[in-house]
């Protein structure tokens, strides 16, 4: 069994203010069991953007049906983008446990925000 990889295909994504940003992420294996979380930034100060397991994230929707048993696509869409959303977003796989522990991170996708077209 190949070790799980977290694939964030795009190094960068550019979106106009007010639009939605799609950040792609797929994993290459169903093992180990555990949730996906999205963060902006890295390190201890990183900001949680989406947690597959729990929480309320009104601007974030999953692109595919993440509840599907064999789902490997954890891409997200963030609505109504503003300049404050700029940064590098990481898709992170966690291993199920008490508590869940970080298993592997994607390479990151840098989101840049263009001025709203006039």
């Amino acid at each position: 069994e190949e070790e799980l990889q977290v694939i964030q295909p795009d190094k960068s994504v550019s979106v106009a203010a007010g639009e939605s940003a799609i950040l792609h992420c797929t994993v290459t294996s169903l093992i180990p069991v555990g949730p996906i979380q999205w963060f902006r930034g890295a390190g201890p100060a990183r900001e949680l953007i989406y947690n597959q397991k729990e929480g309320h994230f009104p601007r974030v929707t999953t692109v595919s049906e993440s509840t599907k048993r064999e789902n490997m696509d954890f891409s997200i869409s963030i609505s109504n983008i503003t300049p404050a959303d700029a940064g590098t977003y990481y898709c992170v796989k966690f291993r199920k446990g008490s508590p869940d522990t970080e298993f592997k991170s994607g390479a990151g996708t840098e989101l840049s925000v263009r001025a709203k077209p006039s």
Epitope: Q5, I7, P9, D10, K11, T26, T28, A107
Partner: antibody
Framework: DVQLVESEGGVVRPGESLRLSCEAS????????MTWVRQAPGEGLEWVST????????YYADSVKGRFTISRDNSKNSLYLQMNSLRAEDTAIYYC????????????WGLGTLVTVSS | ALTQPASVSANLGGTVEITCSGG????YGWYQQKSPGSAPVTLI????NRPSNIPSRFSGSTSGSTSTLTITGVQAEDEAVYYC?????????FGAGTTLTVL
Amino acid sequence: DVQLVESEGGVVRPGESLRLSCEASGFTFRNSYMTWVRQAPGEGLEWVSTISDTGDTAYYADSVKGRFTISRDNSKNSLYLQMNSLRAEDTAIYYCAKSWIWWTFFDYWGLGTLVTVSS
Amino acid sequence: ALTQPASVSANLGGTVEITCSGGNSNHYGWYQQKSPGSAPVTLIYADTNRPSNIPSRFSGSTSGSTSTLTITGVQAEDEAVYYCGGSSTGDGIFGAGTTLTVL
């Protein structure tokens, strides 16, 4: 064994239409994104179109957008490419390919079928 | 766009590296085509993964914006065109191809 078998291509005139099909076996077709890639004579590989596992999302290269339509029938393990308003520059070998996990990666390819657009 | 050398050469039994760089991709794949019009064969997908039917002399690695296909113990039958492929849709998926000549 994974097998992807494209239908016979053919010779058509500019402006005409042609439909290609690809029959898949040896894997769970309904779970796989599928792709058409082409290669013009003496040229490199060019991505044409990709369709999602359920068939509800399709992606197209700018060069074929509005003229080509990708579709699939999961009950028949078949992939299709409807090519309309064909141009001389569409002359190529068309390969059916199975996408792996992320759709720009391909793990299996068909043998290809030649489409010639000529007056 | 993905950039790769137009051609490289290697001695029989030697080692050769083919690079692919540029574009907006975090990940890369490698495909081999032995003659024009023949079906491509996947050598590497997602940087390092090798299909089970591919010999272990083919390996892939990615560092930053550059992916490298390494062939160790080059065989005569490795003479072919090698295409890199990117993970970002904006990259046009494929590089222009590198022709490997075995000396």
